[in-house]
Interface confidence: medium
């Protein structure tokens, strides 16, 4: 007789894929551009990025440092109007790309909960809630909560009002610290909340440092559902050399939870190229045009355009591991499992009862190295087999689909490897 | 062909006030974008900002060393860039150019405008 | 703010001898994402407005004889001039434009022994 199936978790829509952050409109749209009739011709692109939510904004009316004159009822005159906004939903919604607002009050100021007011705050954003699930958002998001006096119980009456209202409705925190008992204080009053933090910002150095802190937040956590980040707001070039950004997009998308990225981590954005704008909210790279201070300073492969044109682009190799986060049982709700690989590497299993599992292995070294899996670390129902298909490798020049000899495998610096093989009774 | 002229330097007193102009000619004034370069009596050139393009929103660049005291303006229907200056210094002394950018780098210059500021 | 310092302050010159002029830069205008040296340079003849020789360090602007060449990456340019000419007497400026503001060499004085 056949086993029978485990039984599929309750799946919510950002359980499904990605979220893209899109903080500044005028940044991500460019040319003198930047509102809300605009982004709606730019739907098309996320949805071949095959993204679940897109974060935006804030877009709402705010003086800076200014309570009286910040109003998150009202859409900026600069992004549009509400009518804009609500084509703009309605267009998303057609796209199955649902919209997150973001709602940090004082975001062109100094403390972006104005300090000194923050009952007067808290009421604006209670209202606020109100006010955009009526008209149809799909979730919220606050940042820089470390700077909101009392935030877990302000989350949690949050996260009432936006579940109050639906089930399938969303709620992101997010805050600039990278403390997990801070982080786990945050979280410990408020089940379904996802939050955005800089815990894995300083990751980079190496394999083993990074499975640390990915498995100790994983145990910390529990069975709840987490997101994966750099930070809160900020791009992957903020942290990361450019030689580890595929190792990042693999992990990201292959980790248990929900992948959060910023406009332009899909193509390696990064203001160190730009001179004059900002590191937070550089100009996206569209064309070699976008950025027309320094002329020449933009080559082809730098932007969306060039590397649309390039399969072996970040941008195609984001594209693929998106589609892939989105359809795949294993990647969608599997189990995981960390396993030793040997030094500077990082390698675990996804896998869901009887569909096809998935191996990772990540080379965070500056040097190749031979991966000797420790499949006696796995417990029986994740165990290895003696092959697996190779999926994709961040590096060019490796035979995709070739079965490749686990006991043998050998990685390239900074490569990452996906692998798959089926369920084995 | 592509044509600055600078016109408006002269003598100031020190905390006084100056517009210095110029008029362009040769090039689609709206697409470019242009700056303003200085250069002290017998000293190097100093970079003061920049004024962009129509499709840049005509946004501006500054220097720590004049921002809040200088603005740079420009009138397209007559293809003319402006210098405001306000509360001139004595080290504010020099001759000032307008230049068509690329926009980093330097391309076109004018001739250049002598502004002195002394008591 | 990122200085640019040219050496030497003076150079005297021999028609038909190659000259060298240098410029360090107090950080590195090499940007990894695209391998660009954020550097141009300039020449002032005497009583002229300045104009463009070199930019990207080692890109000749149109029109510029190919006597002018520039090398270098990072924090290290040099503009060469293969075979000097008697019209090329003047100040010779370097220029950074990685990061606001953009700042100019104190100059070298090019003349004729």
């Known amino acids: 007789r056949a086993p029978r199936c485990r039984e599929l978790p309750a799946q919510k829509w950002w359980h499904t894929g990605a979220l893209y952050r899109i903080g500044d409109l005028q940044a991500f749209q460019g040319h003198g551009a930047g509102n809300l009739a605009g982004l709606k011709g730019r739907l098309d692109y996320l949805s071949s990025l095959k993204v679940k939510g897109l974060v935006l904004g804030p877009i709402h009316k705010n003086q800076k440092d200014d309570v009286a004159q910040t109003d998150l009822l009202q859409i900026d005159p600069n992004f549009g109007s509400k009518e804009d906004f609500d084509s703009l939903l309605q267009s998303a919604k057609k796209k199955s790309i649902r919209v997150i607002l973001d709602l940090t009050p004082n975001y062109r100021g100094e403390n972006s909960w104005f300090s000194t007011q923050v009952d007067t705050v808290a009421t604006k954003v209670k209202d606020a809630l109100e006010f955009w699930l009526q008209a149809g958002v799909d979730g919220f998001q606050v940042r820089d909560i470390e700077n909101l006096k009392d935030a877990s119980s302000f989350l949690a009456e949050w996260q009432n009002i936006t579940k109050g209202f639906s089930e399938d409705r969303l709620l992101i925190a997010g805050t600039n610290s990278s403390d997990l008992q801070q982080i786990l204080s945050l979280l410990e009053s408020n089940k379904d909340l996802l939050l955005t933090s800089s815990y894995l910002s300083d990751s980079g150095s190496t394999g083993e440092h990074t499975k640390s802190l990915v498995t100790q937040y994983l145990n910390a956590t529990g069975n709840r559902w987490c997101s994966w980040s750099l930070s809160q707001a900020r791009l992957l070039t903020s942290f990361l050399p450019a030689q580890l950004l595929r190792l990042y997009q693999l992990m990201l998308f292959t980790l248990p939870g929900t992948p959060v990225f910023s406009y332009g981590d899909e193509i390696g954005l990064d203001a160190a190229a730009l001179p004059g704008q900002p590191m937070e909210a550089p100009v996206m790279l569209w064309d070699e045009s976008s950025f027309p201070d320094i002329p020449g300073a933009v080559s082809a492969n730098m932007t969306v355009k060039g590397q649309s044109e390039d399969p072996g682009s970040l941008l195609s190799l984001f594209r693929r591991l998106s589609d892939q986060r989105s359809k795949e049982r294993s990647l969608l709700h599997g189990d995981f499992h960390a396993f030793s690989a040997g030094p500077g590497l990082f390698s675990y299993i996804r896998h869901w009862d009887q569909n096809e599992r998935f191996l990772v292995v990540l080379n965070f070294g500056d040097v190749g190295l031979s991966a000797g899996l420790q499949a006696s670390d796995l417990p029986a129902s994740a165990s290895l087999p003696a092959k697996a298909d190779l999926l994709l490798s961040t590096q060019p020049g490796r035979e995709e689909g070739s079965p490749l000899e686990l006991e043998r495998l050998k990685l390239e610096p900074h490569e990452g490897l996906l692998l798959r093989f089926p369920y084995a009774a | 062909e592509v044509q600055l002229v600078e016109s408006g330097g002269g003598l100031v007193k020190p905390g006084g006030s100056l517009r210095l102009s110029c008029a362009t000619s040769g090039f689609t004034f709206i697409d470019y974008y242009m700056s303003w370069v200085r250069q002290a009596p017998g000293k190097g050139l100093e970079w003061l900002g920049f004024?962009?393009?129509?499709?840049?929103?005509?946004?501006?660049e500054y220097s720590a060393s004049v921002k809040g005291r200088f603005t740079i303006s420009r009138d397209n229907s007559k293809s003319i860039l402006y210098l405001q200056m306000n509360s001139l210094k004595t080290e504010d002394t020099a001759v000032y150019y307008c230049?068509?950018?690329?926009?980093?780098?330097?391309?076109?210059w004018g001739q250049g405008t002598l502004v002195t500021v002394s008591s | 703010d990122i200085v640019m310092t040219q050496t030497p302050l003076s150079l005297p010159v021999t028609p038909g001898e190659p000259a060298s002029i240098s410029c360090k830069s107090s950080?590195?205008?090499?940007?990894?994402?695209?391998?660009?040296?954020?550097l141009a340079w300039y020449l002032q003849k005497p009583g002229q407005s300045p104009q463009l020789l070199i930019y990207?360090?080692?890109t000749r602007e149109s029109g510029v004889p190919d006597r002018f060449s520039g090398s270098g990456s990072g924090t290290d340019f040099t503009l060469k001039i293969s075979r000097v000419e008697a019209e090329d007497v003047g100040v010779y400026y370097c220029?950074?434009?990685?990061?606001?503001?953009?700042?100019f060499g104190g100059g070298t004085k090019v003349e004729i022994k």
């Open positions: 004024i962009r393009n129509k499709a840049n929103r005509y946004t501006t």
């Open positions: 220029q950074q434009y990685y990061s606001y503001p953009y700042t």
């Open positions: 950080q590195s205008l090499l940007y990894s994402s695209n391998q660009k040296n954020y």
């Open positions: 990207w360090a080692s």
């Open positions: 230049t068509r950018d690329r926009p980093a780098w330097f391309v076109y």
